[in-house]
Each structure stands twice: as C-alpha cells, then as structure tokens.
C-alpha cells in the first residue's frame, strides 16, 4: 500500500484522481479538434495533508517545512504520478487524423 | 526557451527554485543523520499563472479548467521537474555510512 492512503479530512477530500467534463470550447480546442465534442479530463485534485501519498523524500521534507514555515513553504501539491494516453481526431490541411497524446490524462496521483 | 518564462505577477513571484535552510531538528532527522547539521533545501515555490512554465498539455488544460471551474479545479502547482542528488552521513548500527538521496533537492521547476 502506498504511503499514507487514509484521508484524515474525510472520504474523497484528499489527493485523488477525479474526472472533469470539458467541452472543446472550454479547452480552446474547437478550431482544431473534431472528436470527441467533450473531453473527460482525469486530473489530480484534493488536499495533501501530512505524509498523504507522499511521492518521495522531497515531499516529506516539504510537509515538515510547511508546518514550520507556512508563509514561506507551501504544502505538498496533488499532481499526476503517471498519465494515460488520449486519442483526438484532429482537423488537418488534408482532412482529419487520429492523434494520441501521452501527457493529457492523469492516471494516478501523488503529493509533491 | 521554456513555455511562458515571463512572470506577469512581478519578479520572483512565479514558480521558481528557492533555497530554504532547515536544521536536522526541523526535518525530524536528528536521530539518524550526523551530517550536515543544516540542510539547504532547494524547493519549488511560487504561483503558476496562465501557461507559466506549463509542464505539458495536462497543465495547459488545468489552467483552462481552473478559469472555468475554480471551486473544483485548482490552478497548476509549482513542483520539481528534476532533482539533484544529496549526500547524508547517517548513523548506523555499526557506525556511520555515506548515503546518496536522488529525490531530495529540487533542481528545476515547472507548473503542473
């Protein structure tokens, strides 16, 4: 089990994967993407309380220093640990193309 | 040059590398680290305004969605893009050992 997977703030409130619906207009993609018309963006959202899903030693240090110097050092932040590929059908000069993006959808989250 | 390296909030206010001095006591390391007595921790601190040092497409999406749904989607966060190794002299059962940690000091920062 990963370091600190229990959320002390209540279920669903700590750093985890979350799906956010977005239209092509929301993303500013309407002029170059044909499909999908809406995107399910998986992203990392939630608080990073002490040692919750700490990514590495740097994250552990950050937690300690945030406790001591909260005005200077921010708390660790919930960010993607890895990504899932996403396929878009794009408009091109000659027609359309199927394009895969490897850094668009979060797959797993941690605190850093 | 990296995407969006100009800080619109004023010099030094956006995501960048900072050095924070910390004692072994601050870090809770006093019982297992002999040297150094103080650590110069390099960490990533600062705001991530629109497209500033965006790490990838996910970060760009996050910026767009934060603008639309600020209660749900946080702004991108300033985190290490890479690390520098750090050597600690540790206490062991038999004496001391020299240990290198690869994920302790931030080397470079980006927004994600």
């Amino acid at each position: 089990a990963r370091n600190g997977d229990h959320c002390p703030l209540g279920p669903g409130r700590c750093c985890r994967l979350h799906t956010v619906r977005a239209s092509l207009e929301d993303l500013g993609w309407a002029d170059w993407v044909l499909s999908p018309r809406e995107v399910q963006v998986t992203m990392c959202i939630g608080a990073c309380p002490s040692q919750f899903r700490a990514a590495n030693m740097h994250a552990q240090i950050k937690t300690s220093l945030h406790r001591l110097k909260p005005d200077t050092v921010p708390a660790p932040c919930c960010v993607p640990a890895s990504y899932n590929p996403m396929v878009l059908i794009q408009k091109t000069d000659t027609g359309v193309s199927l394009q895969t993006y490897d850094d668009l959808l979060a797959k797993d989250c941690h605190c850093i | 040059a990296r995407n969006g390296d100009h800080c619109p909030l004023g010099p030094g206010r956006c995501c960048r590398l900072h050095t924070v001095r910390a004692s072994l006591e601050d870090l809770g390391w006093a019982d297992w680290v002999l040297s150094p007595r103080e650590v110069q921790v390099t960490m990533c601190i600062g705001a991530c305004p629109s497209q500033f040092r965006a790490a990838n497409m996910h970060a760009q999406i996050k910026t767009s969605l934060h603008r639309l749904k600020p209660d749900t989607v946080p702004a991108p966060c300033c985190v290490p893009a890479s690390y520098n190794p750090m050597v600690l002299i540790q206490k062991t059962d038999t004496g001391v050992s020299l240990q290198t940690y690869d994920d302790l000091l931030a080397k470079d920062c980006h927004c994600i």
């Epitope: 279920p11 669903g12 994967l17 619906r21 809406e38 396929v87 199927l98 959808l105 | 209660d71």
Partner: antibody, heavy 114, light 110 residues
Amino acid sequence: QSVKESGGRLVTPGTPLTLTCKASGFSLSTYWMSWVRQAPGKGLEWIGTIYAGSGGTWYASWVKGRFTISKTSTTVDLKMTSLTTEDTATYFCVRGPNYSDAIWGPGTLVTVSS
Amino acid sequence: DIVLTQTAASVSEPVGGTVTIKCQASEYIYSSLAWYQQKPGQPPKLLIYDASDLASGVPSRFKGSGYGTEFTLTISGVQCGDAATYYCQCTDLSSSAGNTFGGGTEVVVK
C-alpha cells in the same frame, strides 16, 4: 448518433456470454463507454467503463473479475463469466458517463436460468 | 465504491406541485453528479449533468443543485408526464468512486 447492444439470450448458470455494443455516427476511439444493467423491477447498476482511446478500464467493486470490458475498432464488448440467476437483467451500453449528451442503447436482455 | 443514497424510494405530488429528490454521496465528489429519468420499458434519459447543468431538450422546470456530498433534483410545476423513476449517478471515474447509481426515487403524480 446511437449505440445498440446485441448478444443477449437465455443461458444456463455458469455459461459464459459476450455482449457487443456497436456505435453509429461517432468514433468509439475518442469516447468513454460504459455498461450498465438493470434486473427486472430493480434499479440501475453500473458495471464498468472503458476509455476506448487507451483501453483503460474501471469496474464496480462487485464485478470481482467476472466481467471484462474490451474494445475493437468498431465495438465495445462485455465478456461475462460464471453467470448466475442474479445476473438476469437488461444490459445497456452507454456513451458516457459524463457527457452532456449521454447516449443509451435500447438494452439487450440476458436471462440466466436452469 | 462510493455509495449514493436516495432517501425516498417514492414521492407523490399533485399536478402543478414541486417535487424534491435528494441524493447523498458517501464521499466528496465535487460536482460529478448526473440525474436520469426512466420510464417503464425505456432506457434512462439524461436530465442534469455536472450537478446543475440542464441537458439539451430538458424543460427548465427540472433543476439540479448541490456540491460535494449533498445533491438535489427539483421538479417545479410537476406534470403527469413527469411520472417516472429518477436516479442520481456519480460521474467521477476515479478508482475510489466509480459510476455508481443511487437506488432510485419513484415520482407519482396525482
């Protein structure tokens, strides 16, 4: 744009069965697709979801490996094993879950009986 | 998986009245909630997505509200054609949540 399920039939307990969902008017490769079931006179029950772009899957905890969602270039399939009478239901294919224009198929009936 | 609880299994309201259906999530899901209407023999029809956004073609008397763990579907000026079963669904695809449905609330119009 529409989806249609097929493959539902009467089977005996323990018989494996595969249901197929075919999409019309849109490219499966860019959408999330789900399977949902509804036992006679009961509520809706989410089975699982696949992102056809990557093949990534999510399942309800009760599935416990008995059902598998997979994709081909033109279909999304639901493979079911170790069927029991409790699995008797109408099975729906859905373009979703989280689209403002979620599309549901008419459903296909699976009856498990000895 | 997340649990969605629809407190009332059935509600009855005269034509023109207001129906309120509640849905409570066992964990914090922000605005990741949809509401569906289902009539006998038909697949469900999407009414509300993202907790409060009205799906295309749905009359404005249907209103979704809520955020986090508490959600509500309100039907104002209820009509005979609104008699159906209403389900909430978590639309978050995280590993801990899943796209669970609530147990459903039957609306009877008198």
